[in-house]
Interface confidence: medium
């Protein structure tokens, strides 16, 4: 549609798992020069914010401060940018990005079988399990933007366990996991302690990658 | 709940200005759109323009521009209507509406209404 | 003259099914902008029935549905009841007008007794 922008990027800085109390950057960006951009939070808690683009070489920019760190702040944002003043008109929306707060709750436990070191080719499974009664668990691997996410299975021995699967082990790396209830999908555990799965052959850097979340697309957007 | 008070009825002059006000209560607008919408004694709904606080500025229908201003008193989280050079095709009730700024975009709460007379 | 086209009046009897039209064009509906339908008590401001072409705010009975084809949408009451007496306005946006925001000259619907 003639005059309808195409999404801006969103991204956050350090990254989108933000501990409790601290800050994380949304910087949504584009190639247009767009005059607004607006920052908008899904759900029960959901919220708008404003700031005026800054333009360098070619990109606009706007960095958004979000933190402390609460729950209330958590969920899922998307960004627009907006070039004229008359009428409103929003670009589409960026691609969703989902901003988690962890450190609420015990860390659960990461271990590896065989065991953290294994041969090239080898199988390997990373287990995350606790004693809390978590309905989800979420693998994240050091450098990686996406996590793996399974359920938890029943409780076994007074634990709840949920095991990924990485397959042929053709990488290492360090691993995380962390533990979240279903009526709180945006509120996750304290991590638990980093794990180093190294692998001895030949290593490449390939990562079960799980599917992206649907992106919203755009109708033309406005403002009233 | 947030509700959208306005101010009450008014009698006004021909070539005089009106000035009606919409005070959010119970929440506030600064993230919203407020717009205004009259409606004539029968007749149908129409845009007059409308204010996005955050943004500071304010857009018309072209069936207004120049004659309506549109403003907003963040910290009174009251947003404003003037009309001027009143005529007396300008009787009508006015209407503030809240709209978000993304889906839903629909004007989701809207003020009781305020009738404005036009009469020498 | 709307922009939006939208039938004078309809009427029906209690239980029927009712449908009102909005034609839009390239502009606005076809362009792909959102249609959101307003209900008018007498006496009473506006208020939301439907928003973004087929979603119902929580309060609405399901006896409403909204949807939207091309340039046009319409809006469906079954079961018709006394209380929908009113008047029925849709509304969008047109990319080709500063008056941005367009409604339907409205209909009223009449619950035959």
């Known amino acids: 549609h003639e005059g309808v922008h195409r999404k801006p990027s969103l991204l956050a800085h350090p990254g989108r798992l933000v501990k409790s109390e601290e800050t994380v950057i949304l910087q949504c960006w584009s190639d247009v020069r767009f005059e607004h951009f607006l920052l908008h939070r899904e759900g029960k808690f959901k919220d708008t914010l404003h700031l005026i683009g800054e333009h360098h070489d070619g990109v606009s920019k706007a960095n958004f401060s979000i933190g402390p760190m609460m729950q209330d702040l958590a969920g899922t944002y998307r960004c627009y940018g907006s070039v004229t003043h008359s009428p409103y008109q929003l670009s589409a929306p960026s691609d969703p990005l989902d901003i988690v707060i962890t450190g609420l709750y015990e860390k659960p436990s990461l271990s590896a079988q065989p065991g953290p070191t294994v041969l090239a080719g080898e199988s390997v499974t990373l287990s995350c399990s606790s004693r809390s009664s978590y309905d989800m668990y979420h693998l994240s691997r050091e450098g990686e933007a996406h996590e793996c996410r399974f359920s938890a299975g029943p409780k076994v021995n007074g634990t709840f366990q949920a095991d990924f699967p990485l397959g042929p082990a053709t990488h290492g790396g360090t691993y995380r996991c962390f533990g979240s209830f279903r009526d709180s999908p945006y509120e996750w555990s304290n991590s638990s302690d980093p794990l180093l799965v190294s692998v001895t052959g030949n290593p490449s850097n390939s990562w079960p990658s799980p599917t992206e979340p649907s992106s919203k697309t755009g109708n033309p957007r406005h403002l009233h | 709940q947030v509700q959208l008070v306005q101010s009450g009825a008014g009698v006004k002059k021909p070539g005089s200005s009106v000035k009606v006000s919409c005070k959010a209560s119970?929440?506030?607008?600064?993230?919203?759109?407020i717009s205004w919408v009259r409606q004539a004694p029968g007749q149908g709904l129409e845009w007059m323009g409308g204010?996005?606080?955050?943004?500071?500025?304010?857009n018309y229908a072209q069936n207004f521009q120049g004659r309506v201003t549109i403003t907003a008193d963040e910290s009174r989280n009251t947003a404003y209507m003037e009309l001027s050079s009143l005529r007396s095709e300008d009787t009508a009730m006015y209407y503030c509406?809240?709209?978000?700024?993304?889906?839903?975009?629909?004007?989701?709460?809207w003020g009781q209404g305020t009738l404005v007379t036009v009469s020498s | 003259q709307s922009v939006l086209t939208q039938p004078p009046s309809v009427s029906g009897a209690p239980g029927q099914r009712v449908t009102i039209s909005c034609t839009g064009s390239?502009?606005?509906?076809?362009?792909?902008?959102?249609v959101h339908w307003y209900q008018q008590l007498p006496g009473t401001a506006p208020k939301l029935l439907i928003y973004?072409?087929?979603n119902r705010p929580s309060g609405v009975p399901d006896r409403f549905s909204g949807s939207k084809s091309g340039t046009s949408a319409s809006l469906a009451i079954t079961g018709l009841q006394a209380e929908d007496e009113a008047d029925y306005y849709c509304q969008s946006y047109d990319s080709s007008l500063s008056g941005y925001v367009v409604f339907g000259g409205g209909t009223k619907v009449t619950v035959l007794a």
């Open positions: 204010i996005i606080p955050i943004f500071g500025t304010s």
């Open positions: 119970g929440g506030t607008f600064s993230s919203y759109a």
């Open positions: 390239s502009s606005n509906i076809g362009a792909g902008y959102d």
């Open positions: 509406a809240r709209g978000e700024l993304v889906d839903p975009d629909a004007f989701d709460i």
């Open positions: 973004g072409n087929s």
